[in-house]
């Protein structure tokens, strides 16, 4: 395929894999997709750190990358014909796996507008610098490449795979080797969390001799949201080592019998779970792990807990604290939306008032309604506004254009309207003549 899986990091409910290989963005996405994932999202600082960790793992194994400034594709792309939107954090780009626009971004430099071709984003790694959590890889935007021509400095890509849940790694109570095979076809002996539907092959023994036993387990859902291997007791136990090897594979306490056998135990306030290895708090909520108004909710068997937020709030990335939901992101209002702690309120533009079908709707204010008109004479209601008009012989006046002022027809822009004398009246005028002259039937001339 032109790409090698070199590194994997699993955390929360997702795994990230880093691959080296000079592939175009489309080829990289296809590679991730074939195994059930997508090019990685980087939707938060925390996720950026996970991606950085998997890239650091890759770089430790990769002898020498050709470019000092190396680029690795992530799943942020902008289709041809879709223009840059500088007001948005993602600048009009979107995640290949779908999902909402996210507030986090880490652009390398100001983006140039170009709608004529598809654009793709890669993470820019300066290999002359150590990868530090405080210095997260910057986002670099450029052409997406084509087969055989991935683009300058493209050295690989990062995939993301999401799962229902994860199992804890298997604990060995004696010499042996665990090999995990994940659903995305990666094998590893060291995962801090093992994704649902992964297989674990355990070969017990010192390695130089023939293995004495081997075991096979699958990470499965044992009960709603409870993911476990279904193994009971420590694996690869050896009377030779007792509790001295990896604490007997026990989560907390290990107790040796005189015959070389041993049992796992738990500290006060904890209890041993069905796997006879792991300890869980008798009541995980008793330590008040949830913050910021979050309520602690016990999971099945009292094994775990989740924090639940009041309405209008959601859990932050730590899953322990509540943060306000910005309901305005979903555009619930017809016109203006104001986010408030725990909720939101809709407001209407000037010239509109709340009302009409649907929540948050606005309807036009009829400024010309009886007893409400701001106009001195005529009033015409318009959508969101109004305009005043004046009867013949009057013109709009006043700063706000609501008053009517008599037109002095005697000094009209077309010159004098009367041949001789002109008398202005409210809203009109009439002509007159000097003594000895008579106003003609046309009301203008004097004869």
């Amino acid at each position: 395929t032109g790409a090698d899986t070199e590194a994997v990091v699993c955390v929360g409910t997702a795994c990230y894999t880093a691959h080296s290989g000079k592939l175009s963005a489309a080829e990289a996405q296809n590679h991730c997709n074939q195994n059930g994932g997508n090019l990685a999202t980087v939707k938060s600082k925390e996720e950026a750190q996970h991606v950085q960790r998997v890239l650091a793992q890759l770089l430790r194994r990769e002898a020498a990358l050709t470019a000092r400034m190396s680029k690795f594709w992530i799943g942020l792309q902008r289709e041809k014909g879709k223009c840059l939107d500088p007001s948005l954090p993602l600048k009009g780009f979107s995640w290949v796996g779908g999902g909402e626009d996210t507030p986090y971004s880490n652009w390398h430099k100001e983006l140039r507008n170009s709608c004529i071709s598809k654009r793709c984003v890669s993470l820019l790694l300066d290999l002359s610098q150590p990868l530090l959590p405080s210095r997260l890889p910057k986002w670099s935007e450029g052409p997406c490449g084509s087969p055989g021509s991935p683009g300058s400095n493209i050295e690989g890509f990062v995939c993301k795979f999401s799962f229902k849940g994860m199992c804890r790694p298997l604990a060995l109570g004696g010499p042996g080797q665990v090999t995990y095979t994940t659903p995305f076809q990666t094998t590893s002996s060291s995962l801090e969390a093992v994704p649902f539907a992964s297989a674990a092959n355990v070969a017990c023994g010192e390695g130089d001799k023939d293995e004495t036993q081997s075991h096979y387990f699958l990470c499965k859902e044992k009960a709603p949201d409870v993911f476990d291997w279904g193994s009971s007791g420590p694996l690869c136990v050896s009377p030779k080592y007792g509790c001295n090897f990896n604490n007997g594979g026990c989560h907390q306490d290990c107790f040796e019998g005189g015959d070389g056998s041993f049992l796992c135990g738990c500290r006060p306030g904890f209890r041993l779970l069905d796997d006879l290895v792991t300890c869980a708090s008798r009541n995980p909520c008793s330590s008040s792990p949830c913050r910021g108004g979050a309520t602690c909710v016990l999971g099945p068997h009292g094994k775990n807990y989740t924090c639940r937020c009041p309405q209008g709030y959601q859990l932050d990335s730590s899953q322990l604290d509540c943060v306000d939901v910005d309901e305005c992101q979903d555009s619930p209002c017809a016109q203006e939306c104001v986010n408030t702690p725990g909720g939101f309120r809709c407001e209407c533009w000037v010239g509109y008032e709340p009302g009409g079908p649907g929540e948050g709707a606005c309807q036009d204010v009829d400024e010309c309604a009886l007893g409400r008109s701001p106009c001195a004479q005529g009033c015409t209601n318009t959508d969101g506004s109004f305009h005043c008009s004046c009867e013949e012989g009057y013109v709009l006046a006043g700063e706000d254009g609501t008053q009517c002022q008599d037109v002095d027809e005697c000094v009209g822009p077309g010159g004098p309207l009367c041949d001789s004398l002109c008398f202005n009246t409210q809203g009109s005028f009439h002509c007159g003549c000097l003594p000895g002259w008579v106003l003609a039937p046309n009301g203008v001339s004097c004869t």
């Epitope: 096979y216 387990f217 279904g230």
Partner: antibody, heavy 118, light 112 residues
Amino acid sequence: QVQLVQSGAEVKKPGSSVKVSCKASGYAFSSYWLNWVRQAPGQGLEWFGRIYPGDGDTDYNGKFKGRVTLTADKSTSTAYMELSSLRSEDTAVYFCVRGDGYWAMDYWGQGTTVTVSS
Amino acid sequence: DIVMTQTPLSLPVTPGEPASISCRFSQSLLHSNGITYLYWYLQKPGQSPQLLIYTMSNLASGVPDRFSGSGSGTDFTLKISRVEAEDVGVYYCAQNLELPWTFGGGTKLEIK
């Protein structure tokens, strides 16, 4: 389509053992829990165990632990339920049932009648 | 073990009339993930049980929409809007939140 076909009726003496089979077809046998449920004559339903054929992981109702053994043969997509030390109160219809992703028991075998009588 | 009480034991209904069966559990079946792991099964005379409703309110494939499920964390109801002759049998509620999975005692629906 998903099918679970169970072995035929059995008549057993108290103290003996019985082994009921359940052949699955129409789905990925290794990837779903297979439950065993029994129903005594004129009584309700009672869950007594399950197996995950993918790796042979089992869970038992504590009431039957030690007397029941569940096994599965992936090569033939067949699950087995063996109940030992039979007593007259084990007389019942035994069902094998697939568990789906929502934990529902969505497909049931036709049932196997086990009669324990001296 | 989670214990459940199903009522009534027997339910005679006239065809075309509605019917309602209740099930009460000794603890909440609402998981912290927001899903309620409550199920309803029907065992028609001489047949294996069949799934009617999963996770409290979702209709299983092929089940007529005259059946509906509702409830809170511990109290649940199965409703049949208009009973038909083919609906006779024993209805069971069940929980799959915690091992061992448990069933209610059953409600026998018969036609008047």
